[in-house]
Amino acid sequence: KFSKQSWGLENEALIVRCPRQGKSSYIVDWYYSQTNKSIPTQERNRVFASGQLLKFLPAEVADSGIYTCIVRSPTFNRTGYANVTIYKKQPDCNVPDYLMYSTVSGSEKNSKIYCPTIDLYNWTAPLEWFKNCQALQGSRYKAHKSFLVIDNVMTDDAGDYTCKFIHNENGANYSVTATRSFTVKDEQGFSLFPVIRAPAHNETKEVEIGENTNLTCSACFGKGAQFLATVQWQLNGNKITDFSEPRIQQEEGQNQSFSNGLACVNTVLRIADVKEEDLLLRYDCLALNLHGLRRHTIRLSRK
């Protein structure tokens, strides 16, 4: 539990966190276990300690070994061990098993591949992604923050995915790569282009001036759990939050699952004390998922 394996490639940055976590105010001392030699904290060193982190900028094969971190609170000292292995760069495309991070599984409705260990680094978007060493291109691949999203995942999307990013330390840039396998699960669920159940397109609803009224936007997106499925209202093409009228409020979407297994979401628009000017507005029910956007419009009329 308090000994952690870390690995990297020579000439790349490697940052390792002390497996023994403590409060951020605690002092952390790092040592090279074999020699009990203290790791310096000065950033001019290629290998230096920075609180909970041990930084190899860049790493060399000779850095391999066990590093001890001692986390010191005012009254307690607690020890952790980082087992670091630095490998030579592979001449060919194959990524050996010992360089692979944990395998992740995905399906059509959940195809996120997180870039391993990236939270330890000072990086800026976008990430570069490769599959079996080929740069990923095409609209199906979306690099978002620290993960990759694949649209319409198919079984042949399985494979080894490598993320590549730049770590910046005091103005100097260092490359980092990390690889993990992605497997595709064949699930019973599926997602469809959104189907709006209510309101009907170009519907008109009769309302009483001065009364309260509710408009329900209800849409279905397929079967089973959905990766992305949102239902919301717009007023004259604007988000409700951008429309500064406190009488008109949108409830958070409520998930519904019908007996036929359809995954649907309902979002209610509440209008208090209906006024004449509300009859002039265009109310758009929007349903959005990875397949696209569908819009139904409803207007209000006086009863």
Epitope: K1, F2, Q21, K23, S73, F76, R78, T79
Partner: antibody, heavy 123, light 106 residues
Framework: EVQLLESGGGLVQPGGSLRLSCAAS????????MIWVRQAPGKGLEWVST????????YYADSVKGRFTISRDNSKNTLYLQMNSLRAEDTAVYYC????????????????WGQGTLVTVSS | EIVLTQSPATLSLSPGERATLSCRAS??????LAWYQQKPGQAPRLLIY???NRATGIPARFSGSGSGTDFTLTISSLEPEDFAVYYC????????FGQGTKVEIK
């Protein structure tokens, strides 16, 4: 000097309620996770509940879940234990204690304890 | 929950003798184990944390060892003030205590 002082114990009927307090001093209260531990007469120690520092996340032993509520007022340096639906088996000395280390999701030892307050549940 | 079993329930020894107390966990707790001493009418006092580290101010005659599921508290030479009840506590998964070992004067 770190001090923890429990109060609020006493005799209560089964099904009744009681609120224990623990006044802390001598350390930055809001930073530390705080714990209630109890000890039935002549028996061993039993962890009851933990509350995180600023985050305020709470954890309970199965034996008290749904009946007891741990809370804290960092502005008053005070820890509380609201005990509802009390049973005879809740009779014990209740100690408040400090966890000097924990980070979110982990637990550690208890380095300072109060002197305890006796709760007796009896008709 | 993780169950801690302490043995023996009672240990009868004379001052100056060596005391060996055992604590066994129902599943591995790594080194997330502590030992406490409790005297009648007092709150427990922390002796050992992380299985083998002495807490501040604890005399060197107290030592802890073990990891995983089997742990030992050793008092190398009992002093009169060491006669008390000793509890082990795990903090690997929430918190549980052993039922205690009473060290009494023979």
């Amino acid at each position: 000097e770190v001090q923890l002082l429990e109060s609020g114990g006493g005799l209560v009927q089964p099904g009744g309620s009681l609120r224990l307090s623990c006044a802390a001093s001598g350390f930055t209260f809001s930073v530390y996770d705080m714990i209630w531990v109890r000890q039935a007469p002549g028996k061993g120690l039993e962890w009851v509940s933990t509350i995180r520092g600023e985050g305020g996340g709470t954890y309970y032993a199965d034996s008290v879940k749904g009946r007891f509520t741990i809370s804290r007022d960092n502005s008053k340096n005070t820890l509380y234990l609201q005990m509802n639906s009390l049973r005879a088996e809740d009779t014990a000395v209740y100690y408040c204690a400090r966890d000097p280390w924990s980070t979110e999701g982990s637990f550690f030892v208890l380095d300072y304890w109060g002197q305890g307050t006796l709760v007796t549940v009896s008709s | 929950e993780i169950v801690l079993t302490q043995s023996p329930a009672t240990l009868s020894l004379s001052p100056g003798e060596r005391a060996t107390l055992s604590c066994r966990a129902s599943q591995s707790v790594d080194d997330d184990l502590a030992w406490y001493q409790q005297k009648p009418g007092q709150a427990p006092r922390l002796l050992i944390y992380d299985a083998s580290n002495r807490a501040t101010g604890i005399p060197a005659r107290f030592s802890g060892s073990g990891s995983g599921t089997d742990f030992t508290l050793t008092i190398s030479s009992l002093e009169p003030e060491d006669f008390a009840v000793y509890y082990c506590q795990q903090y690997n998964d929430a918190i549980t205590f052993g039922q205690g070992t009473k060290v009494e004067i023979k």
